[in-house]
Amino acid sequence: DYKDDDDKFRDCAEVFKSGHTTNGIYTLTFPNSTEEIKAYCDMEAGGGGWTIIQRREDGSVDFQRTWKEYKVGFGNPSGEYWLGNEFVSQLTNQQRYVLKIHLKDWEGNEAYSLYEHFYLSSEELNYRIHLKGLTGTAGKISSISQPGNDFSTKDGDNDKCACKCSQMLTGGWWFDACGPSNLNGMYYPQRQNTNKFNGIKWYYWKGSGYSLKATTMMIRPADF
């Protein structure tokens, strides 16, 4: 943990600009609050300053969690984790953020989707996701349905399907009915990762039944 006691950083971009340019876990402070949260900062990719808000890489963390757990975050910032919807909502309503989603398949390929505008609505509005300005190599159509859906978990069903997507597909996500993606689905190891309806899905890159090897969701201020 690289936080200095006197430093107050809202995101990894502020950490980077303060001179801390090494990848690692830093303590961030909620906007307009003294509440703190630990996050992994990627200080190397694409110029650095990225706040990692989600990571899947080995199946070591269970992502079939409750609304409250997705709200406050869970897992280990140095490995698989979810940073927390409340922090991300507060942060992305302060200024304009970009969202980059980096994906790896089991054949050694990598791809990304970059959204030039990203924010989450408040909890009152079920942390609805808002995305605009898609570019990248992981599909010309957004695998997160647009305009964004409300967030759903196993105990908080806000999707557009009578089927309860979060229970059926596992994991909390911005499900439609149920939609073309779920990066918080079941982790399937190699050779068990095809024809899986409830895996880690990004439809417009790998199709509906392919479960990915690794995913990272990261945000950074647009004016970084």
Partner: antibody
Amino acid sequence: DVQLQESGPGLVKPSQSLSLTCTVTGYSITSDYAWNWIRQFPGNKLEWMGYISYSGSTSYNPSLKSRISITRDTSKNQFFLQLNSVTPEDTATYYCARSTFGHYVSSMDYWGQGTSVTVSS
Amino acid sequence: SIVMTQTPKLLLVSAGDRVTITCKASQSASNDVAWYQQKPGQSPKLLIYYASNRYTGVPDRFTGSGYGTDFTFAISTVQAEDLAIYFCQQDYSSPPTFGGGTKLEIK
């Protein structure tokens, strides 16, 4: 259901200010989304004028920036357009509309019925 | 500003025909393009957003496609009630800008 209703004078004299009100029902303008003014000139050309977001931030069309102001009254769930120093070229039908994104320009899913404004002496 | 060049300006069609309208952006608009229908005496209505997504309640005879600079809107089987002006709009960059409109007239 979300409804938007424009109101204001139908006739404004040149060099004066045009002031319009948009009253929103069925959704709080402080909850989410951006709240826009768009105008349609005779001949059907559409022009986005600007918005006020749910957080209160504003964005204006650079072609109007020196003349336009969009404000709101959250207690009445209304937002307002003021356009200064009008000329006959500002004669148009003025619409208010909600866009599907709160921090930037976007497509607009709910529109008012429009109010016709003529600038003439 | 991104200029949206919409063609044609007028479409004279018969009920049952398939029609296609195109919009060309002066620079990339990603997939941030919407299509609106404006019937006589009414305000514009959103039909398509993010280039290809049909808005709630819009019949499936209306479709959109495209990415970058070239966008297409189609009505697979024109009906009498489709008489209207159709507009494209980019909202990739500010200010958002509209095409000049295509007037659809039924023979």
